[in-house]
């Protein structure tokens, strides 16, 4: 059964030409997370498994950079880059939980952070 | 359509070298790890070497550790094994595939293999 | 010698089920993925089961994984004649970091 919940940075929006830290928490589970999957709509971004390491799809690489964690780090901004993002923990035994993330690039210099919320 | 191709198996005598290749297409090479697994006469699969996505993280067999090496170059979407201190217990039918996204979950496709004897 | 455990062959007639096992141990079955293969003579193997118990698009429904402690089993109900093959099971090893096979079980479709 699956008793986890993940946690995410929730909808946040950030400065064209900056940086953003998109982040996951999986809790209330004591189940191995085997791999991290990041991916934007339907594209990879990134995969983040406990064997192998880290790896930046080939399209993204200049732009996109591992971590803090199991997060990822998103970099020079455009406004193209506004959309959902999925974290997706394929864990043993539970199975795979799914976090969203919706991150809004704006031009201007206003750029306030969401609150955090929770995916069951 | 997905596809990989091996090529370069032949007639080597024992303690010579060879390098296998294995060509893909139809897909994001670098998104995928990648495996080799040989198949002897009349016996059954046995996983030989394992690549991760930019070839920093390599696993081998114990059969083959210290002889064989893998590699890949993504810039031209393929995958080597390079053989050395060839036996007679390596003759086989070498094929090399590709993992799963989430790299413990299978392997999902095959070549149609390449024939390596070994004998003097 | 195969680090996992598959009994040399197994047979059934038309339309009967018949299951295959694959016993492992606590490093790789009972912590990890297992998946399945199909190989018929003088060709490839092909993916029937990944991740213990799903089936990729296009591998009929009569296939099934299924995954209990250190044992995982693959299902065939409906047997056809096409179906007499070798099939392998596999898993990744935590402790020995490694791709382990099974021996291979040789179905024969009587």
């Known amino acids: 059964m699956m008793t986890g919940t993940i946690e995410t940075t929730g909808n946040i929006s950030a400065e064209k030409g900056g940086s953003i830290i998109l982040q996951c928490h999986l809790s209330s589970t004591t189940a191995q997370v085997t791999q991290v999957n990041w991916e934007q709509q339907d594209q990879l971004l990134a995969i983040c498994n406990a064997d192998l390491g880290w790896h930046i799809s080939p399209s993204f690489k200049d732009r996109v950079a591992p971590g803090p964690g199991l997060g990822l780090t998103l970099q020079s901004l455009t406004v193209n880059d506004t959309g959902e993002y999925f974290c997706i923990y394929h864990t043993y035994p539970d199975g795979t939980y799914t976090g969203r993330i919706f991150l809004e690039v704006l031009e201007s210099s206003v750029a306030e952070h969401g609150a955090r919320f929770q995916i069951p | 359509e997905v596809q990989l191709l091996e090529l370069g198996g032949s007639l080597v005598q024992p303690g010579g070298s060879l390098r296998l290749s294995c060509a893909a297409s139809?897909?994001?090479?670098?998104?995928?790890?990648m495996s080799w697994v040989r198949q002897a006469p009349g016996k059954g699969l046995e996983w030989v070497s394992l690549i991760n996505w930019n070839g920093d993280k390599t696993y081998y067999a114990d059969s083959v550790k210290g002889r064989f090496t893998i590699s890949r170059d993504n810039s031209k979407n393929t995958l080597y094994l390079q053989m050395n201190s060839l036996r007679a217990e390596d003759t086989a039918v070498y094929y090399c595939?590709?993992?799963?996204?989430?790299?413990?979950?299978?392997?999902?496709?095959w070549g149609q293999g390449t024939t390596v004897t070994v004998s003097s | 010698q195969s680090v996992l455990t598959q009994p040399l062959s197994a047979s059934g007639t038309p339309g009967q089920k018949v299951t295959i096992s694959c016993s492992g141990v606590?490093?790789?079955?009972?912590?990890?993925?297992v998946s399945w293969y199909q190989q018929l003579p003088g060709t490839a193997p092909k993916l029937l089961i990944y991740?213990?118990?799903q089936r990729p698009s296009g591998v009929p429904d009569r296939f099934s994984g299924s995954k209990s402690g250190t044992s995982a089993s693959l299902a065939i109900s409906g047997l056809q004649s096409e179906d007499e093959a070798d099939y392998y099971c596999?898993?990744?090893?935590?402790?020995?970091?490694?791709?382990?096979f099974g021996g291979g079980t040789k179905l024969t479709v009587l």
């Open positions: 139809g897909f994001t090479f670098d998104d995928y790890v």
């Open positions: 606590s490093s790789n079955i009972e912590i990890k993925y």
């Open positions: 596999t898993s990744w090893d935590d402790r020995l970091k490694s791709w382990v």
């Open positions: 595939a590709r993992h799963w996204i989430v790299f413990q979950y299978g392997l999902d496709v």
């Open positions: 991740n213990s118990h």
